[in-house]
């Protein structure tokens, strides 16, 4: 397949990735599905610079990212290694808090109002950010 040369309309380019910032809220799974339907994934934060870039665009608003521990260990949706990668949790987080009374703990990560991360109930309707890589091969069949 061919490589994507530029970002789709309404997406923002940064360091060879394209980002789309929602203005409405969805549960984590719905946000994850939305990004997948756009041939993208929930944002995966791999560096100081990417954290700052995303933080600038979302402002002080709770926003889902592509990090969860619904199957046990924390995992990035694109397979990026969590243990060795960039982390920006708030102090005392993640805490898998059960005291919210909604059933279960907290298995999905989001940006908080100061940009640092928190784990929360995945059903909360937060904004989200989709990311896709510019050098990712598109799904279109090659021209013959």
């Amino acid at each position: 397949g061919s490589e994507r040369a530029c970002c789709p309309v309404n997406w923002v380019e940064h360091e060879r990735s394209c980002y789309w910032f929602s203005r409405s809220g969805k549960a984590w799974a719905d946000a994850d599905n939305y990004c997948r339907l756009e041939d993208a994934h929930l944002v995966v934060v791999t560096s100081w610079e990417e954290q700052k870039f995303v933080q600038h665009h979302i402002g002080p608003v709770n926003t889902w990212m592509g990090l969860h521990d619904q199957n046990g260990p924390w995992k990035w949706v694109d397979g990026t290694d969590y243990e060795t990668g960039f982390k920006n949790w708030r102090p005392e987080q993640p805490d898998d808090w059960y005291g919210h009374g909604l059933g279960g703990g907290e298995d999905c990560a989001h940006f908080t109002d100061d940009g640092r991360w928190n784990d929360d109930v995945c059903q909360r309707p937060y904004r989200w950010v989709c990311e896709t890589e510019l050098d990712k091969a598109s799904q279109e069949p090659p021209l013959l």
Epitope: W48, E49, K52, F53, K87, N88, P91, G115
Partner: antibody, heavy 118, light 107 residues
Amino acid sequence: QVQLVESGGGVVQPGRSLRLSCAASGFTFSSFGMHWVRQAPGKGLEWVAIIWHDGSNKYYADSVKGRFTISRDNSNNTLYLQMSSLRAEDTAVYYCARDLSMGGMDVWGQGTTVTVSS
Amino acid sequence: DIQMTQSPSSLSASVGDRVTIACRASQNIISYLNWYQQKPGKAPKFLIYTASSLQSGVPSRFSGSGSGTDFTLTISSLQPEDFAIYYCQQTYSTPLTFGGGTKVEIK
């Protein structure tokens, strides 16, 4: 009151090692990232390193990478800078500073002087 | 690495003057720019963060502006205690970098 106090500076020969300490008080040390910043005599400020509140991330200036190690002991409210293979150009006043939102430094210590000389 | 260039490197001004210091980044740093004040023999003092937000306790005569690559620190009416060296600092990218400083002297 919020306070940072550096110690451990002194005169050391090139190639030798030194460990600086920064004692924090008046705030919840374990909730804040911390920096080391240095200032050579008569020169400007040079950032050295940062460590996250929980030690999960550490970043260094290119000039010290591989020679200096930043660490912390949250149980003792202390920040450290282990300096090895010291060079004359490492001579400076070393400040520790509290991090504000990945990079800003809102509280500073009074500094400790390191002189690298034979 | 992102280079930070301040201008002028020094300036002379009188009490009551309006003073402006410029800081330019070698690449876009959005609004991740801080300002510090340092007096001789003392540690730096945090003045302004994210280009224009005044740190708690800093007099309102200090203000910051700019985004992208060009930033400004303004002292609306210079006071005797404002004579010092001022540094800008970018926090968009590591390694974090400071400008070379601007010395504000008494005319």
